[in-house]
Interface confidence: low
Amino acid sequence: EAYKSEIAHRYNDLGEEHFRGLVLVAFSQYLQQCPFEDHVKLAKEVTEFAKACAAEESGANCDKSLHTLFGDKLCTVASLRDKYGDMADCCEKQEPDRNECFLAHKDDNPGFPPLVAPEPDALCAAFQDNEQLFLGKYLYEIARRHPYFYAPELLYYAQQYKGVFAECCQAADKAACLGPKIEALREKVLLSSAKERFKCASLQKFGDRAFKAWSVARLSQRFPKADFAEISKVVTDLTKVHKECCHGDLLECADDRADLAKYMCENQDSISTKLKECCDKPVLEKSQCLAEVERDELPGDLPSLAADFVEDKEVCKNYQEAKDVFLGTFLYEYARRHPEYSVSLLLRLAKEYEATLEKCCATDDPPTCYAKVLDEFKPLVDEPQNLVKTNCELFEKLGEYGFQNALLVRYTKKAPQVSTPTLVEVSRKLGKVGTKCCKKPESERMSCAEDFLSVVLNRLCVLHEKTPVSERVTKCCSESLVNRRPCFSGLEVDETYVPKEFNAETFTFHADLCTLPEAEKQVKKQTALVELLKHKPKATDEQLKTVMGDFGAFVEKCCAAENKEGCFSEEGPKLVAAAQAALV
């Protein structure tokens, strides 16, 4: 349906509060360096304009596209050239090129300092004084750090944030109430950001087909009672939603997401028995609840897969007549029967099945050729199962920090050219898979671990794409989305790497290390470990364990000393000399 004024249509659909929030998020994701107040003004002006168009649709400029209106607004920012350099050149272009240009300038690693929340009393005073501004600040700070954050979900998290403050600012001990709740929310937000970045990368680098395949597998696992047509309908709508958000079309994205939630709730009988609770909630909570809803029970009467996909004499005919539909049906049927498999594994199985049919349907006797296709899946299933088992055992033995260090060594040896901060960040996140997944029951471990690893490795790919330094990383990132994790797992030590020159400055530590929170202390130690490996890539695990143990003792000793700085400057060089000697 065509509307006279697109902006009025979105304003009416979303309501003023959500409209303003989404505009603020959109601008913050595009112009990540601008101060909060600039974005507040821009969002206010756009919202006022939308309100005027809603009152009078034929008003001046109300018929313009959202890209034109938003782009024109962005191009009024006075400091565009100073703050963003060549991004200002986007303003010379016409739509849709201008929007594409803005998208290309989104920075996945803007390098802002971590958000340090002020004291609880200050936060509560600010929250109670001006709630709207306070929540706007939250949207802005998250959006500029995560330029691909799923915008409607960010509005939901802002609502959760508001709930936390409404509750905790009344509490006797505000800090005790806020601390754990804000930390739990922070973890959720970071995971949400990484998951959406993975979805956007799937769409942008591998296209709609890859994203749809991923979604078919995931939704078939979650809604095994729904038929393939129903899953396909939801997947098509979901793809549109994520394409819009990944493309910066946040108003359309949020509006379409609300429509999808409405559709699912109106058709819950043919989707899942688990949706009822979600469907009684208001729109933001409803969509979030549907996205996180627990898996429905499997129907009891599922026939063997072999009947339709191996034994049926028409397999090649069905495949050749409509390849994507046939493979989609195979993926759907396989996924709904295997909730314990990771989505990545299911997609690898579907790919293997496709390759087998391509080969066999060209032979004289296809049925004989593909007769054992399902048995040939075994090694593909065994590989992630063994990987998860081995790594969970290692995690249980070493704990999270030790497991992170093991991964740090592993990945630095695989790709020593990658920057130290990236190796530390990614290995720390990979290490969290242990905490997140290893305590789960066997039936949930693989899907938890491998799908989480895919999301984290996507972060490595996104950061590496910005400044490519390793051909092997580029290869693993770009060849196949579903095989990224096995590709990285299969990388051996890079024998072509020329060790980095020793730089004493890298291993110089100061007393400020002692006052850092534990996590930041760990990052400092892990940074030293990576630098050590880049200097001595042939170091054995035993040598590294010794050196890291000495390093830990050195930090502990100096932090307990009367003259901390004196201790660091005196003992530091001795430690470095001992480490160099130990690693000869």
């Epitope: 002020p118 004291e119 005073a125 600010a126 004084d129 600040k137």
Partner: nanobody, 124 residues
């Protein structure tokens, strides 16, 4: 644009009191969070106190809690800092600041406008 001018500084004995004023010109202050910061000789600038736009919420640094009181009179376009039980370590140049979009009161980067400062010396 808002211009801020502090007054009321001076020399006072330990245990004594002073009242600082911050007069704004050029714009109403009712849409600004008002804050006081100080810089002691050779030290970094530090947050002292802040008051919300309506005056309903106040916030203090731990070091001055219970001794200093911040208030404002929007009709007079003035903010105040009543300082009691002064100590030698309160000696500093005191600045008044106004923040249009301030959401986290104790962060100096949240304030858009600053006065030149008024000197407070606590000494026997």
């Amino acid at each position: 644009e808002v211009q801020l001018v502090e007054s009321g500084g001076g020399v006072v004995q330990p245990g004594g009191s002073l009242r600082l004023s911050c007069a704004a010109s050029g714009s109403t202050i009712s849409s600004y969070v008002m804050g006081w910061f100080r810089r002691a000789p050779g030290k970094e600038r530090e947050f002292v106190a802040a008051i919300s736009r309506s005056g309903g919420y106040t916030y203090y640094a731990d070091s001055v809690k219970g001794r200093f009181t911040i208030s404002r009179d929007n009709s007079k376009k003035t903010a105040y800092l009543q300082m009691n039980s002064l100590r030698p370590e309160d000696t500093a140049l005191y600045y008044c600041a106004a923040g249009r979009y301030s959401a986290w009161y104790s962060q100096s980067y949240e304030y858009d406008y600053w006065g030149q400062g008024t000197l407070v010396t606590v000494s026997s």
